[in-house]
């Protein structure tokens, strides 16, 4: 058993049929010695008396809020949560496996630039009685500070018969140099509590590997005289690291109709303009990627050909 | 401690082309190592990230763009002085700081060159003949060093009398290639910045 936060404890259980469970001793936080009784959750049934209560925690029915009283007055609470371990593996029931970029990916993180600011998100089908707490650091043995905000519900989607909820959190490394060469990864730890179930999820990454620039901005078209070609120009996104001559981007320019199966014109360039062939009912799209370290491409920025 | 804005004309900067070739060569070599050594811990997640130039050179700090010198987190206290007569400095007005930056890059290359050559000598003794260093990568390191053209004491190639542990050597190769790729990215950024300034 260990303390998650004040008055909240996590009991780690090997989860299999007829498992013996864990013996837990609860102590009432009071100077009183006599006349103390214990109850669980909203029940008025007295579970025991005395300053300490010993219980055998085997299942979720044994978890919950234990309260010690004296003469009708509440003295203190202890909330017991269960963390299940099945076949030596901690349960991952609360969050959905996003399976990208690999299986067992529960947390996904992205950074728009090298400032040390990043966003992580996760998915769940659970809508109520759900709380998250996020911690982060650079390295684990001698951790350096990363400050994370509160996790918030950022999107709701309908997937078949199920509703899917996306939560996200923003974090900022306390003293980040955009030009630094990372040798210790960022560690992100998410504590998830659903009703009386506790789970924890972790992710470890270098900022350089989770970079995904915002799409290029200010796309403009200029038709070329006596030609089917148009010159398309754009600018670096505002959120990208500066100076741009140091943090350079490379771009992919594509002309395509509405369907992905349609024919297209595609060209890659390090410049902020390119010449392409525009077709009726097609769109010109441009996306960006770090020129020197190939992490993710940005989403497309698009303008219609006409 | 930082790069000044007054630097050579764009077309006058011979190191940019070499630095692009360097990043390409080390990226290709790393990809080859990851494929060939698929049963070894050779991915970014699996290896320890070591920097053989740590406390010996200060490339990131010495080559910091002017715009980032306002960022306290970028200003480390490390200072290293180097010889200042490189041929990439196409302008006589080029400041001492830029010379410091380019000579720091030169020292990085020299250190990695020695390590890679020593490692290759060991890998050539491996009866499995599983992996060798790409001669093109070694040649590209050499070309960039020549373009930088700094006078520097030659570092003797390390020779080892004991029988090499080929497993350890291959893991060290992965560690070295990952670190060198990161440094090559920094070098490319620096050259691009200098070329544009």
């Amino acid at each position: 058993i260990w303390e998650l936060k004040k008055d909240v404890y996590v009991v780690e259980l090997d989860w299999y049929p007829d498992a013996p469970g864990e013996m837990v001793v609860l102590t009432c936080d009071t100077p009183e010695e006599d006349g103390i009784t214990w109850t669980l959750d909203q029940s008025s049934e007295v579970l025991g008396s005395g300053k300490t209560l010993t219980i055998q925690v085997k299942e979720f029915g044994d978890a919950g809020q234990y309260t010690c009283h004296k003469g009708g007055e509440v003295l203190s609470h202890s909330l017991l949560l269960l963390h299940k371990k099945e076949d030596g593996i901690w349960s991952t029931d609360i969050l959905k496996d996003q399976k990208e970029p690999k299986n067992k990916t529960f947390l996904r993180c992205e950074a728009k630039n090298y400032s040390g600011r990043f966003t992580c998100w996760w998915l769940t089908t659970i809508s109520t009685d759900l709380t998250f707490s996020v911690k982060s650091s650079r390295g684990s043995s001698d951790p350096q500070g990363v400050t994370c905000g509160a996790a918030t519900l950022s999107a709701e989607r309908v997937r078949g018969d199920n509703k899917e909820y996306e939560y996200s959190v923003e974090c900022q490394e306390d003293s980040a140099c955009p030009a630094a060469e990372e040798s210790l990864p960022i560690e992100v730890m998410v504590d998830a509590v659903h009703k009386l179930k506790y789970e924890n999820y972790t992710s470890s990454f270098f900022i350089r590997d989770i970079i995904k620039p915002d799409p290029p901005k200010n796309l403009q078209l200029k038709p070329l005289k006596n030609s089917r070609q148009v010159e398309v120009s754009w600018e670096y996104p505002d959120t990208w690291s500066t100076p741009h001559s140091y943090f350079s981007l490379t771009f992919c320019v594509q002309v395509q109709g509405k369907s992905k199966r349609e024919k297209k014109d595609r060209v890659f360039t390090d410049k902020t303009s390119a010449t392409v062939i525009c077709r009726k009912n097609a769109s010109i799209s441009v996306r960006a990627q770090d020129r020197y370290y190939s992490s993710s491409w940005s989403e497309w920025a698009s303008v219609p050909c006409s | 401690r930082n790069l000044p804005v007054a630097t050579p004309d764009p077309g006058m900067f011979p190191c940019l082309h070499h630095s692009q070739n360097l990043l390409r060569a080390v990226s290709n070599m790393l990809q080859k190592a990851r494929q060939t050594l698929e049963f070894y811990p050779c991915t970014s997640e699996e290896i320890d990230h070591e920097d053989i130039t740590k406390d010996k050179t200060s490339t990131v700090e010495a080559c910091l763009p002017l715009e980032l010198t306002k960022n306290e987190s970028c200003l480390n206290s490390r200072e290293t002085s180097f010889i200042t007569n490189g041929s990439c400095l196409a302008s006589r007005k080029t400041s001492f700081m830029m010379a410091l930056c380019l000579s720091s890059i030169y020292e990085d290359l020299k250190m990695y060159q020695v390590e890679f050559k020593t490692m290759n000598a060991k890998l050539l003794m491996d009866p499995k003949r599983q992996i060798f260093l790409d001669q093109n990568m070694l040649a590209v390191i050499d070309e960039l060093m020549q373009a930088l053209n700094f006078n520097s004491e030659t570092v003797p190639q390390k020779s080892s009398l004991e029988e090499p542990d080929f497993y350890k050597t291959k893991i060290k190769l992965c560690i070295l290639l990952h670190a060198f790729r990161i440094r090559a990215v920094t070098i490319d950024r620096v050259m691009s910045y200098l070329n544009a300034s």
Epitope: R228, Q229, T250, R261, E262, K263, K264, D265, R266, V267, F268, T269, D270, T275, I277, R279, K280 | -
Partner: antibody, heavy 118, light 107 residues
């Protein structure tokens, strides 16, 4: 199986014109750009131009501008390349090639040898 | 027009050995570079798109690298069926242009 089948070899006099055909099978004809590339004996490849069969848009290499005409007939899934004012240096194998991507080629025709000789 | 220069023009190689062909552009073309293989009397066959993207059905021994002005096609271990002429082609701008070709011959 996508295939491009070209018309047979031709022998032409200098100053005359030649029209080579390229019939596509497999896949929808208008879903691809169609190019013409030539190769003189013992020489390399030389791009001549492209057509979008969907709308008849064309683009020609400056070297052939005014002398080459590329057309397409959607009803027969056939593209044509006509080269006029032939000279002996136009003796080459002319090949059609196609792709959904405009600027490179994934399927090629077998080539048509055009010999220009007096 | 962008001029593509291949080297060497002729490359004698022992079967089983690796081979590398270089292609240089007269100006920077990013990764807009494609490789083709042509055997005598046959149409060219696409090997690599956009400098390094492998093409479905092409053996993994063929790989491409490069960006800007310098590109390389590498055949890791030459098989008898690989003896042919190889062409690079730029798609950065029109007119599309090819290298002169490199003939890979049996040593």
């Amino acid at each position: 199986q996508v295939q491009l089948v070209q018309s047979g070899a031709e022998v032409k006099k200098p100053g005359s014109s030649v029209k080579v055909s390229c019939k596509a099978s497999g896949g929808t004809f208008s879903d691809y750009y169609l190019h013409w590339v030539r190769q003189a004996p013992g020489q390399g490849l030389e791009w001549m131009g492209w057509i979008d069969p969907e709308n008849g848009d064309t683009e020609y290499a400056p070297k052939f501008q005014g002398r080459v005409t590329i057309t397409a007939d959607e009803s027969t899934s056939t593209a044509y390349m006509e080269l006029s004012s032939l000279r002996s240096e136009d003796t080459a194998v002319y090949a059609c090639a196609r792709n959904k991507e405009l600027r490179y080629f994934d399927v090629w025709g077998q080539g048509t040898l055009v010999t220009v000789s007096s | 027009d962008i001029v593509m220069t291949q080297s060497p023009l002729s490359l004698p190689v022992t079967p089983g050995e690796p081979a590398s062909i270089s292609c240089r552009a007269s100006q920077s073309i990013s990764i807009n570079l494609h490789w083709y293989q042509q055997k005598p009397g046959q149409a060219p066959r696409q090997l690599i798109a956009f400098a390094s993207q492998s093409i479905s059905g092409v053996p993994s021994r063929f790989s491409g690298s490069g960006s800007g002005t310098d590109f390389t096609l590498t055949i890791s271990s030459l098989q008898p069926e690989d003896f042919a002429t190889y062409y690079c082609q730029q798609s950065n701008s029109f007119p599309l242009t090819f290298g002169q070709g490199t003939k890979v011959e049996i040593k």
